[in-house]
Each structure stands twice: as C-alpha cells, then as structure tokens.
Interface confidence: medium
C-alpha cells in the first residue's frame, strides 16, 4: 500500500494505490483511491507512467480527457466513471501487454488540494496448476499441468507425510512455448507417489505464486488449487 | 505533441536580469516539475532547480540561491526563469527540463544568454 | 554534493563497433527505498540532451536496444553494443537520489 499527500501542506489530499499484477491478454486493474470530493466537476485524475511521454488516462470534468493519452495505451484504458464520486480513481487496463509494467502515478487534483501516489505494476501470465494422477505412466505418478506461465516460474513439489523432503531427484519439469511465443505451459511429473498422503505442486514466478494440492487416499483423490499474486502491497 | 519551447537569445550587460520562458504543450502542465538546467560553452550540465508548477514553490540550488527566481504561469502553460546581478560566467545556453518521477525526460531547445560589456 | 566522474573524456569510435563509457560518484547513488537514481543522457551536437536510460538499466521509450546500462552503488556502465552515426554527441550520467541533482562532466563519442 503506498499512501501520497500533496507536496503543498495546506493543499494536499491523500492518495492510495496498490501495487499489482496484470495478466497478459486479460483486463488488469490499477487500484487508486482519494479522498471524494463533493462536485464530479471538480476532480482531476491523471494517470501517468514512468518511461513514458504521453498520459496514460485522463480524466476531468466527468468525463475522459484523452488528447494527450499515449498511443500505446489508446482505446484500452478507461476509469470507474461512477466511482468517482466516492473517491474511487482506478483504472481498467484492457489487454494487458507485457510492456505495462513498470511504475505508475496517480495524479489526483480536487478543490481541496492535490496528491499522488506510485504503483509497481508488473505484468506476465499465471495460471492455477491442476495436478493429476497420471494413469498412463508405468508408475505411481502425479502430472501438475498449468496452461499459462510468464516469465519461466520454478516448480517446486512437496509432500505433507514427508514435510521437508526434495522432490526435485523424483519430479521432472518442462515448459512448451504457447502459440503466441510469450507464455509457456508447465508441466511438471512427480514420480514414486505413495497412498494416503498429500502431494502439493507450487509453481511460483516474481508475480504469482500457484499451488495445486492432490490428496490420494485408496478410496479417493481430491484436488484444490489456488493463486496468490505475490506484489500487492498498498501505498 | 509534448514540446517546450523557450524564449531567444539574449544579450546582457554586468549586474542586469535576465528572464527566460518555457512554454509548455502537449501535456497538463501542472502535472509535472519543471526544471532548468545550466550549459556553460563547452561545458557540462548544472541543475540550477526547479518549480512545483502546480504550488508555484520552487527548490533551487544552492549555488544558485539568491540570484535565481523561477516562477510559473499556469494560464499559459509557461514556466520563467529569472536570473539576476549578472556575470560573464553566466555566459551559457539554459535549458527548460520536465521532471517525470526522477529523471528529465523533455527538454527545451535551450536559451543562449551572453554576458557582456 | 555527489560528484559524478565520468571516464573517458573523449572515446573515438569505429562504425559497428563497441563502446563504453563508465561513470562514478563520490557516494552511493542507492536511495533508502532500494531504487538507484542513475540515469544517462546524450547530447548531440548542437541539440538538447535527452534521457536514454534511467534507473540504472531501464531505457527510455524509443530508445534503440544496442543502449544498456549497468552498475550498483557508486559504479556505473553505460555500453553501445555497435555504434552507428547518430550515437555521435556528449554522453552524461546524472543522478537524482541525492539533491543537487549533479551530472557527470560528460563523454564526447566521436567517429574515427
């Protein structure tokens, strides 16, 4: 979380954003708010990103401002025109690129004053691992399959009988470029399993950190995955 | 198009003001800082400060404190530098500079100001 | 103040081939967030500077990728993979972690 005031004491408004994540040919949220002004006409939102010339969005007078908008971010960005109000100024980022990343300001400038505040964004692929008994292996053997990954994650498999144990002599991982050449499919095999434990699949890059659990028991298998994005801090 | 454009050349005696104007296009002025930038011929570069140009407060330099002014006119998107009590090495190009984050990343043309008798 | 020195002074170069320029400052350029304020410029002649690359290693927009920067604390590289015409001018390094923000005394490239 990263808090801003105005640099200016008498007119300085706090603004917070937190840091996040995009995923690559999805919609991504930059998250900004401020203290609500109570005439739309009065708020200002700029937002701006570091290594660029152009506005990434503007917004005044209740409505979009994008005369000064840079080309690589025509047409895919547009802010909450109805949270405004409330003091909500994020921005949608549609089609997330690889090249998003980096730092952005959010600018804010209501009749109380001004302030702004700085968001990392980073930008890649993360997907939720599935694990799965691999029946047509000669063994007793797991496959954790996730079909989106950028950049290169590591792939880690533990076990919840054997806490502590390396995996990494009994388990094989590879990574297959996708069609679009960017994001790559992991998949990892682990070898060897035993019955009535419970095997974990973290796969983890400096964006996400996923996990695929698979319980094998002799009367059942069951199967949880989750995702965490690893960078949302506030500021 | 983001640009700035600077005033011309000026020609001072010893001991008299110069003022200097940026005038910014292509962006929400009070957006970013506004620098300027001292160039000596055949000389490096020396910050001389710069100016809040949403508050209008200035930082200068230490070597500059004193004898700078710079002020700004958000009506005209235009940024001044005044520098007073003038001496020949003063003799140098001055450059407008947008601060994005922490780097300068427009600059002006530069303005050549020559101090001479 | 941070003195920033530059070295060399003056590099001929040939067409298509590399070169590097290297930067110092008399105290570490890490800033208590982490970030490290150095960033490079170039001056053609008879032209304003402009930002090449900043934060140490990141480049400008438009700026072409046989530019790259390196370092850490006081110590830092700015490298042209294979130089063309129009890299010919005055390179500065410059930094912004500490006010003043100082630059070097610049490197004049030059064709052979």
């Known amino acids: 979380l990263i808090i801003g005031f105005g640099i200016s004491g008498r007119h300085s408004i706090t603004v917070t954003t937190v840091a996040s994540a995009g995923n690559i040919g999805e919609d991504g949220i930059l998250s900004c708010t401020f203290e609500p002004d109570i005439k739309l006409s009065d708020i200002v939102i700029q937002w701006l990103k570091e290594g660029v010339i152009g506005l990434v969005h503007e917004f005044k007078e209740g409505k979009d401002e994008l005369s000064e908008q840079d080309e690589m971010f025509r047409g895919r960005t547009a802010v909450f025109a109805d949270q405004v109000i409330v003091g909500n100024a994020s921005l949608r980022l549609k089609n997330v690129q690889l090249t998003d990343a980096g730092t952005y300001k959010c600018y804010i400038i209501t009749s109380k004053g001004k302030g702004n505040a700085n968001l990392e964004y980073k930008t890649g692929a993360f997907s939720m691992p599935e694990v799965n008994v691999d029946y047509n292996a000669s063994s007793e053997t797991l496959r954790c399959e996730a079909p989106r990954w950028f950049p290169q994650p590591t792939v880690v498999w533990a076990s919840q009988v054997d806490q502590g144990a390396n995996f990494s002599e009994v388990s094989n991982t590879s990574f297959e470029l996708n069609s679009e050449n960017v994001t790559m499919k992991v998949v990892s095999v682990l070898y060897n399993v035993t019955i009535n434990n419970t095997y974990s699949c973290m796969i983890e890059n400096d964006i996400a950190k996923a996990t695929g659990d698979i319980k094998v028991t002799e009367s059942e298998i069951k199967r949880r995955s989750h995702l965490q994005l690893l960078n949302s801090k506030a500021s | 198009q983001v640009q700035l454009v600077q005033s011309g050349a000026e020609v001072k005696k010893p001991g008299a003001s110069v003022k200097v104007s940026c005038k910014a296009s292509g962006y929400p002025f009070t957006t970013y800082g506004m620098n300027w930038v001292k160039q000596a011929p055949g000389q490096g570069l020396e910050w001389m400060g710069w100016?809040?140009?949403?508050?209008?407060?200035?930082t200068y330099a230490d070597d500059f404190k004193g004898r700078v002014t710079m002020t700004r006119d958000t009506s005209i998107s235009t940024a001044y530098m005044e520098l007073s009590r003038l001496r020949s090495d003063d003799t140098a190009v001055y450059f407008c500079?947008?601060?994005?984050?922490?780097?300068?990343?427009?600059w002006g043309a530069g303005t050549t100001v020559t101090v001479s008798s | 103040d941070v003195v920033m020195t530059q070295s060399p002074l003056s590099l001929p170069v040939t067409l298509g081939q590399p070169a590097s320029i290297s930067c110092r400052s008399s105290?570490?350029?890490?800033?208590?967030?982490?970030?490290?304020?150095l960033h490079w410029y170039l001056q053609r002649p008879g032209q304003s500077p402009r930002l090449l690359i900043y934060?140490?290693?990141n480049r400008f927009s438009g700026v072409p990728d046989r530019f790259s920067g390196s370092g850490s604390g006081t110590d830092f590289t700015l490298k042209i993979s294979r130089v063309e015409a129009e890299d010919v001018g005055v390179y500065f390094c410059s930094q912004s972690t500490h006010v003043p923000w100082t630059f070097g005394g610049g490197t004049k490239v030059e064709i052979k």
């Open positions: 500079a947008r601060r994005s984050f922490w780097y300068f990343d427009v």
């Open positions: 100016i809040d140009t949403y508050s209008g407060v200035p």
């Open positions: 934060k140490v290693s």
């Open positions: 105290q570490s350029l890490v800033h208590s967030n982490a970030n490290t304020y």
